[in-house]
Interface confidence: medium
């Protein structure tokens, strides 16, 4: 039975050109992470496995960085950064809890008149 | 569950060359981490060499430039070439691989760096 909960930050925004920290946080269960996936849409971002540590997929290796802990640093932001991101905990014995965060980067003279994204 | 079977251990001269294989069968995943360990005797396991399904590799700072660690998804085996042996990578070499839940190991091979 899967007991566990993933915190995520959520809906955040950025400016473009800057760096955000995408995190998540599983709870609430005592099953053993043994691997997170972040992906983007349906594309594989990185992988941090127990055993075998980190791996960034070669077309973002310029601007992802690993952590803090089994988070994600994006770095060098574009408006195209913008969207769904997942963060995909495989666990022993629970199985797979996946966590959602929206992105959306703005144009620095908008990020900087206090303009926020928000999904009701 | 996935099998792994290592091969290619030996007793080589210091600055010799060998070339590990670790043939996986069984249950797969297309995301997957592959990867070397070492124990030497008396000594912690630990990671030498991994490499993703995307291709990115990882290397511990002691075999960077010595090592190169390698993949062929079609067979479903990882390789570790390891040139410039010296006596200090004497060891028993394990294989891993994850798709994400636990990892599965292989039996070990051994490497003796002697002359």
């Known amino acids: 039975m899967m007991t566990g909960t993933i915190e995520t930050t959520g809906n955040i925004s950025a400016e473009k050109g800057g760096s955000i920290i995408l995190q998540c946080h599983l709870s609430s269960t005592t099953a053993q992470v043994t691997q997170v996936n972040w992906e983007q849409q349906d594309q594989l971002l990185a992988i941090c496995n127990a055993d075998l540590g980190w791996h960034i997929s070669p077309s973002f290796k310029d601007r992802v960085a690993p952590g803090p802990g089994l988070g994600l640093t994006l770095q060098s932001l574009t408006v195209n950064d913008t969207g769904e991101y997942f963060c995909i905990y495989h666990t022993y014995p629970d199985g797979t809890y996946t966590g959602r965060i929206f992105l959306e980067v703005l144009e620095s003279s908008v990020a900087e008149h206090g303009a926020r994204f928000q999904i009701p | 569950e996935v099998q792994l079977v290592e091969s290619g251990g030996g007793l080589v001269q210091p600055g010799g060359s060998l070339r590990l294989s670790c043939a996986a069968s069984?249950?797969?995943?297309?995301?997957?981490?592959m990867g070397w360990f070492r124990q030497a005797p008396g000594k912690e396991r630990e990671l030498v060499a991994s490499?993703?399904?995307?291709?990115?590799?990882y290397y511990a700072d002691s075999v960077k430039g010595r090592f190169t660690i390698s993949a062929d998804n079609s067979k479903n085996t990882a390789y570790l070439q390891m040139n410039s042996l010296k006596p200090e990578d004497t060891a028993v070499y394990y294989c891993?691989?994850?798709?994400?839940?636990?990892?599965?190991w292989g039996q070990g091979t051994l490497v003796t760096v002697s002359s």
């Open positions: 891993a691989r994850s798709g994400g839940f636990l990892s599965d």
């Open positions: 069984g249950r797969t995943f297309s995301n997957y981490v």
């Open positions: 490499i993703s399904s995307f291709g990115s590799t």
